[in-house]
Interface confidence: low
């Protein structure tokens, strides 16, 4: 004996990404010699059994049997969202509803607010925005592998009344290590199915120079040729170098090249040498103490920096 419930059709709620395809499946155990029908949220009949009722080429018949009516809707638009009704015209008419939820895909985020000529210890603020998501997407920030904690995602309804524009800002203090770093804003949304949708902003940080003196060869001996390289780093890179020999008053100014050359080392060359590397961000002085030994293989030199 069939119960009354056997003539009750059933279906399920569906979620689809905008532009995708959704299949609406309606089943019934006992059709009582009646056909199944699908209608849209505007109550327009889409299919009655295997007969197409609405001229919309996006809607196709998948399965039509006495126990099942399945249709597909391709290139789904946000306007297609709503409750679709499956009906069977028994006495009384029985219906089942399928809520179709359409996900809006967020656009690639846009980063604004970057100001060039950031200096070390300055505070940088960047803004990120992405439109078109439904439900509202979430934005996250990172610098390299490090997560940045931005403001909570702000949500604003788009003019279409269906999708959302999300925005977030992040503020952080820059260091010299941030020079050349990429700040990335990523949008997280279920419509992306884990795919990365992000935008990056490379930042430049101006910072004071540093320098160190590198001897070549590393263990100089009397009679050898020696080059002392003053290796300056910074942004901008130091363009001006000044070599001095300490111990004389005033210190002996020797050259403005980045390398100091001793064609033939002499014991009298022993002493402490200073290199001042200068950029428009400031100066840095490095020291190197040269001890010229007999022309034996025993090395004796040291380098000190500050």
């Amino acid at each position: 004996n069939l119960s009354q419930d056997d003539s009750q059709p059933w279906t399920s709620d569906e979620t689809v990404v905008a532009g995708g395809t959704v299949v609406l499946k309606c089943q019934v155990k006992d059709h009582e010699d009646s056909s199944l029908q699908w209608s849209n949220p505007a109550q327009q009949t889409l299919y009655f059994g295997e007969k197409r009722a609405l001229r919309d080429n996006r809607i196709q018949l998948v399965t039509s049997t006495p126990h099942e009516l399945s249709i597909s809707i391709s290139n789904v638009a946000l306007a297609d969202e709503g409750e679709y009704t499956c009906s069977i015209f028994t006495m009384p008419v029985r219906t089942a509803k399928s809520l179709v939820t359409v996900l809006g895909i967020p656009q690639k985020p846009i980063i604004t607010g970057y100001k060039s000529s950031l200096r070390e210890k300055d505070t940088a603020t960047l803004n990120c925005q992405s439109s078109g998501s439904k439900p509202a997407a979430r934005l996250t920030w990172r610098k390299g592998d490090q997560e940045l904690h931005g403001e909570p995602t702000r949500i604003q309804e788009d003019p279409n009344g269906k999708t959302f524009t999300v925005s977030s800002s992040v503020t952080f203090q820059v260091t010299r290590e941030d020079d050349g770093a990429s700040i990335v804003c990523s949008v997280n949304h279920e419509s992306l199915k884990g795919a990365d949708r992000s935008t990056s902003q490379r930042i430049e940080v101006l910072y004071t120079p540093t320098a160190m003196i590198r001897p070549d060869p590393p263990h100089p001996r009397e009679g050898q040729k020696l080059l002392l390289h003053c290796e300056g780093r910074g942004n901008p890179v130091p363009q001006q170098y000044l070599w001095e020999k300490e111990g004389s008053v005033p210190p002996l100014k020797m050259t403005q090249e980045s390398a100091l050359i001793f064609p033939f080392l002499n014991k009298s060359d022993s002493g402490t040498y200073g290199c001042t590397a200068t950029s428009n961000m400031g100066s840095y002085k490095a020291y190197y103490t040269l001890n010229v030994n007999d022309p034996s293989p025993v090395p004796s030199s040291s380098s000190t920096y500050h």
Partner: nanobody
Amino acid sequence: QVQLVQSGGGLVQPGGSLRLSCAASGRTFSNYARGWFRQAPGKGREFVAAIDYSGGSTNYADSAKGRFTISRDNSKNTLYLQMNSLRAEDTAVYYCAAPASRRPSWDADGYDYWGQGTLVTVSS
């Protein structure tokens, strides 16, 4: 109409844990966002955590990050808030909330339906 019925509050010592539940009636529970809010004595209602309808996207207040976890079981029409490492400043009435549309929101204005509230007291 959506009805939200809460359970799981009570007294707990600092450092302890509690799990709040919020059972919803209404056929489209799974298609709506859900949120937790709290109201400490003498203060306004503040956002704690929210979860979108698929459970794939969550958002937390700074005070809840790393300690609280929001989750949902759509087959049971139930929302949860797992609270660990509780502190005295977590003492408040906790509310679960639901919007009338599928628009997720992180502020109280975006929610239309509210649970009855459940008191969480953190004290030694």
